[in-house]
Interface confidence: low
């Protein structure tokens, strides 16, 4: 049976999925889909990585972890009841039938109180060129095969990770506030 994860309406849901790259940066393609893992690929793909990067995602679905180290856990932002269901994380290891498949069940509960308004990140429409939220490692020399450790308790907020200062200014000028979680 699927491992079950819970979140409340308006919160961010977290669905863990990990693999160990052969070497840092030597990535394996991964897909996330809504629905149980089929024989091949992912159904209803919501996010996909290739050997180098995240190359496809849909609104509200993003990677919060250090995917270069194999943390391909999915974050679903500002969840609604309709987000309930099975999600498939598929690690697409080269070779025939070598894929690792994980089915994760997400249960969305009604909010206890009305959640504060949040800025919804619609990547493919409104702000499609933003950074994923990532922890900044120490400012030390980085060499091939050696990335700074990520302290997950110090993950930068979305506001600190807005890549485009123009977008940040737009948000400030509009009076919008950004709430993570």
């Amino acid at each position: 049976s699927e491992v079950e994860y819970r979140a409340e309406v308006g919160q961010n849901a977290y669905l863990p999925c990990f693999y160990t790259p052969a070497a840092p940066g030597n990535l394996v393609p991964v897909c996330w889909g809504k629905g149980a893992c089929p024989v091949f690929e992912c159904g209803n793909v919501v996010l996909r990585t290739d050997e180098r990067d995240v190359n496809y995602w849909t609104s509200r679905y993003w990677l919060n972890g250090d995917f270069r180290k194999g943390d391909v856990s999915l974050t679903i932002e500002n969840v609604i009841l309709a987000d309930s269901g099975i999600y498939c994380c598929r690690i697409q290891i080269p070779g025939i039938m070598n894929d690792e498949k994980f089915n994760l069940k997400l249960v969305i509960k009604p909010a206890k109180v009305t959640p504060a308004p949040t800025l919804q990140r619609d990547f493919t429409a409104a702000f499609p060129r933003m950074l994923t939220t990532r922890g900044h490692g120490p400012a030390e020399t980085q060499t091939l095969g050696s990335l700074p450790d990520i302290n997950l308790t110090q993950i930068s907020t979305l506001a600190n990770e807005l890549r485009d200062s123009r977008l940040a200014n737009d948000l400030r000028d509009s009076g919008a506030t950004i709430r993570i979680g």
Partner: antibody, heavy 121, light 107 residues
Framework: EVQLVESGGGLVQPGGSLRLSCAAS????????IHWVRQAPGKGLEWVAD????????EYADSVKGRFTISADTSKNTAYLQMNSLRAEDTAVYYC??????????????WGQGTLVTVSS | DIQMTQSPSSLSASVGDRVTITCRAS??????VAWYQQKPGKAPKLLIY???FLYSGVPSRFSGSRSGTDFTLTISSLQPEDFATYYC?????????FGQGTKVEIK
């Protein structure tokens, strides 16, 4: 095989217009960002503009803002750079390049061969 | 705009030499720095991305590192095909900016 092929360059008078095309093959431009980078004769590289075809998001260098327009036709898997009010200082080889949507990793892994734009009377 | 100050602007070296090129960002750019190689009449080629990741197919004699806002491209043992111009680029903020280039010539 991933390929980018530019076309549309040529000689144009100051104040004139040109439209450059960047035809992509081997990948879907909807999953990436397409950039235009130029290089004046004997000079370094200068970023000009970019587009994320999936969302239509565009950005421009200050030096071309209001004069150049970047666009994409996902059905043709092609990006364009419409250049109006051209100036002598726009003379350069124009390259299109593939970038990534996550900006932290948005280095350019594939480039076209370049097309020369000469602005002269 | 973020300035990328690249040095030296040119250098002469021999086959087998260890070559180091540096780029200093005028403000924090995290690890959002790439290095490119360009030969005359050709398009640039990606060598290093995210400050220290070797791009697919690039020989392991090339490496990149970061120390704060200082970024370094190192060629451990220069080969004849490495004589070219090298550019750094930051892509942390708009506009993405390039260093002015370093021409590596044969001594």
């Amino acid at each position: 095989e991933v390929q980018l092929v530019e076309s549309g360059g040529g000689l144009v008078q100051p104040g004139g217009s040109l439209r450059l095309s960047c035809a992509a093959s081997g990948f879907n431009i909807r999953s990436y960002a397409i950039h235009w980078v130029r290089q004046a004769p004997g000079k370094g590289l200068e970023w000009v503009a970019d587009i994320t075809p999936a969302g239509g998001d565009t950005e421009y260098a200050d030096s071309v803002k209001g004069r150049f327009t970047i666009s994409a036709d996902t059905s043709k898997n092609t990006a364009y750079l419409q250049m109006n009010s051209l100036r002598a200082e726009d003379t350069a080889v124009y390259y299109c390049a593939r970038g990534y949507i996550y900006r932290m990793w948005d280095s350019y892994d594939y480039w076209g061969q370049g097309t020369l734009v000469t602005v002269s009377s | 705009d973020i300035q990328m100050t690249q040095s030296p602007s040119s250098l002469s070296a021999s086959v087998g030499d260890r070559v180091t090129i540096t780029c200093r960002a005028s403000q924090d750019v995290n690890t959002a720095v790439a290095w490119y190689q360009q030969k005359p009449g050709k398009a640039p080629k990606l060598l290093i991305y995210s400050a220290s990741f070797l791009y697919s197919g690039v020989p392991s004699r090339f490496s990149g590192s970061r120390s704060g806002t200082d970024f370094t491209l190192t060629i451990s043992s220069l080969q004849p095909e490495d004589f070219a111009t090298y550019y750094c680029q930051q892509h942390y903020t708009t506009p993405p900016t390039f260093g002015q280039g370093t021409k590596v010539e044969i001594k």
